[in-house]
Interface confidence: low
C-alpha cells in the first residue's frame, strides 16, 4: 500500500531489538536502575510514535518513557557537549563519574538511532523518516532529543561542564541541542556555574577561543540567568583524555 | 582514610550457609557499589558482584546468580554477602573491594579477606 | 565472559632485572580507544593491591619501575628493575563486559 515518503533515512534496521537489548545491557551493568522493566521502557517509547503522524509528535508524547526512566546525576558531574560527541564519550568512559545524556538510561536506549511511524497504523517505517530541515522538526527523533535534552538540563546541579568544538565557525551555536535548549534549562537556584572547555583542532592552534565571539555571546546567556561562567582552553585533546587517565603524570603538570 | 574490615573465619557443613560482612569508613557508604571477590586455592579471582547500598540495587556474575545474596546495612555502614548451599569448592577467602569512583570498575580499597572454610 | 591468559605461569628473576608479564584477552578490551585492563599485585595473606588502571595509568602511590602497555587483546606488565619487595603474584583483570574477569596470576620468584 502507498507510504508517505520523506526525506531522512528510515528506522534503523532491528530497532525494537536495539532499544530491548540496550535497555536489558544498560539495566545490568547500572544496579540503580535495576528496577526498571525493560518490556515496559519498550512500550512507552513506541507508544511514543507508533500510528502518530510523525511530524506532529510532542514533548507529551514521551513522557510516560520520561518517567520510566528518571535517573539523576550527582552534582558537579553532567556533561553537556555540542558537535563533539566522540571526545565527550571518550571522556566520560575514562572520568567514569561523569555523565553525558547518552551514559542516561534514555540516551543510551537512542544514541545514533532513527525511528518513525505512521499514522494509523500500527507499523514502523522503515522506508524513510522525516528530516529536521526538509520536512518538519517536530518529528520523532527530535522531539525525543529535545525532551530528554531539557530534562537532563533541569536536573542538572553544582558545576555544570559542556564540551564544545573549537574547529567549527560558530564554537557556541544557538540553534544547537545545547545553545537552544539546554542553556535555557539549567535551574540557577541548583547551578552554581557553567564551564565550557573549548577543545581546538589543530596542533598549533595557540589562540585563546574563549575570545571567541559565540562564546561571549554564551557567557551573556548565562549570565543573565544569574549563572557563572568560565571558560579553558583545551589546546591538545589526545593530552587532554591522557592526562585525565593519569593525573600524576608529569607532563600534565604543564597545559592541556 | 578509607578502609574495609571484614569479619572473621568461618568453617561451616555442606548445605549449610555463611553470612560474612564488610565495614566500612572513610568515605560515604551510600555512594560506592561495594564488589565481593573469591579467591580459591589455586584458582584465580572471581567477580561475583556488586552492590550498590544507596538503594540496594546489585548486579551478580551469572556463575554466582542464586547462590550468592549481597546485602547492605546503609545505618551500620556495612555491607553482607551470603552464599547458601555450600560445597567444597567454596572453601575460599572473600574479599569485599571498592571501585576508585562511580564506574570506576578497578579495585582500589580492599578488604583483609574472610577465610571460609567448608568442611564435614 | 572475556577469558584472560596471562603468561608466563612463573617467573624466575633476580633484583635488578626485567620483568614482563604478558595478559591476553579472548576479545578486545577496547572501548573509546582506551584499553580497559587493570593490574594488580598480591602478596601471601593479603588483598591485591592495585598498580595500574586503564592499560597504562599508573596508581596513586605506585613506583615509577611499574608500567603497563598494550590495547585491544595483548597488555603487559613491565617491573623494571626489579626491588625485593616486588616478588608476588601479579593478575590482570578486565572491566570491558559483566563478568569482569581476572587472569590466571604470574607468580614472580627470586631466582
Known amino acids: 500500500r502507498w507510504r508517505q515518503q520523506w526525506s531522512g533515512s528510515g528506522t534503523t534496521s532491528r530497532f525494537p531489538e536495539t532499544v530491548l537489548a540496550r535497555c536489558v545491557k544498560y539495566t545490568e551493568v547500572h544496579p540503580e536502575m535495576r528496577h526498571v522493566d525493560c518490556q515496559s521502557v519498550w512500550d512507552a517509547f513506541k507508544g511514543a510514535f507508533i500510528s502518530k503522524y510523525p511530524c506532529n509528535i510532542t514533548e507529551e508524547d514521551y513522557q510516560p518513557l520520561v518517567k520510566l526512566g528518571t535517573q539523576t546525576v550527582p552534582c558537579n558531574k553532567t556533561l553537556l557537549w555540542s558537535r563533539i560527541k566522540d571526545l565527550a564519550h571518550q571522556f566520560t568512559q575514562v572520568q567514569r563519574d561523569m555523565f553525558t545524556l547518552e551514559d542516561m538510561l534514555l540516551g543510551y536506549l537512542a544514541d545514533d538511532l532513527t525511528w518513525c511511524g505512521e499514522f494509523n497504523t500500527f507499523e514502523i517505517n522503515y522506508q524513510s523518516c522525516p528530516d529536521w530541515r526538509k520536512d518538519c522538526s517536530n518529528n520523532p527523533v527530535s522531539v525525543f532529543w529535545k525532551t530528554v535534552s531539557r530534562r537532563f538540563a533541569e536536573t542538572a546541579c553544582g558545576v555544570v561542564h559542556v564540551m564544545l568544538n573549537g574547529s567549527r565557525s560558530k564554537i557556541f551555536d544557538k540553534n544547537s541541542t545545547f545553545g537552544s535548549v539546554e542553556v535555557h534549562n539549567l535551574q540557577p537556584e541548583k547551578v552554581q556555574a557553567l564551564e565550557a572547555w573549548v577543545i581546538h583542532g589543530g596542533r598549533e592552534d595557540s589562540r585563546d577561543l574563549c575570545q571567541d565571539p559565540t562564546i561571549k555571546e554564551l557567557e551573556s546567556i548565562i549570565s543573565k540567568r544569574n549563572i557563572r561562567f568560565f571558560c579553558k582552553n583545551i589546546y591538545r585533546p589526545d593530552k587532554f583524555l591522557q592526562c585525565v587517565k593519569n593525573p600524576e603524570d608529569s607532563s600534565c603538570l604543564s597545559g592541556i | 582514610q578509607v578502609q574495609l574490615v571484614q569479619s572473621g573465619a568461618e568453617v561451616v557443613k555442606p548445605g549449610a550457609s555463611v553470612k560474612m560482612s564488610c565495614k566500612a569508613s572513610g568515605y560515604t557508604f551510600t555512594s560506592f557499589n561495594m564488589h565481593w571477590v573469591k579467591e580459591a586455592p589455586g584458582q584465580r579471582l572471581e567477580w561475583i558482584g556488586y552492590i550498590y547500598p544507596g538503594n540496594g540495587g546489585t548486579n551478580y556474575n551469572q556463575k554466582f546468580q542464586g547462590r550468592a545474596t549481597l546485602t547492605a546495612d546503609t545505618s551500620a555502614s556495612t555491607a553482607y554477602m551470603e552464599i547458601s548451599s555450600l560445597r567444597s569448592e567454596d572453601t575460599a577467602v572473600y574479599f569485599c573491594?571498592?571501585?576508585?569512583?562511580?564506574?570506576?570498575?578497578?579495585?582500589?580499597?580492599w578488604g583483609q579477606g574472610t577465610l571460609v572454610t567448608v568442611s564435614s | 565472559d572475556i577469558v584472560l591468559t596471562q603468561s608466563p605461569a612463573t617467573l624466575s628473576l633476580s633484583p635488578g632485572e626485567r620483568a614482563t608479564i604478558s595478559c591476553r584477552a579472548s576479545e578486545s578490551v577496547d572501548s573509546y580507544g582506551n584499553g580497559f585492563m587493570h593490574w594488580y599485585q598480591q602478596k601471601p595473606g593479603q588483598p591485591p593491591r592495585l598498580l595500574i588502571y586503564?592499560?597504562?595509568s599508573r596508581a596513586t602511590g605506585i613506583p615509577a619501575r611499574f608500567s603497563g602497555s598494550g590495547s585491544g587483546t595483548d597488555f603487559t606488565l613491565t617491573i623494571s628493575p626489579l626491588e625485593p619487595e616486588d616478588f608476588a603474584v601479579y593478575y590482570c583483570?578486565?572491566?570491558?563486559?559483566?563478568?569482569?574477569?581476572f587472569g590466571g596470576g604470574t607468580k614472580l620468584e627470586i631466582k
Open positions: 586503564l592499560a597504562s
Open positions: 583483570q578486565q572491566n570491558k563486559e559483566d563478568p569482569w574477569t
Open positions: 573491594a571498592r571501585t576508585g569512583g562511580l564506574r570506576r570498575a578497578y579495585f582500589t580499597y
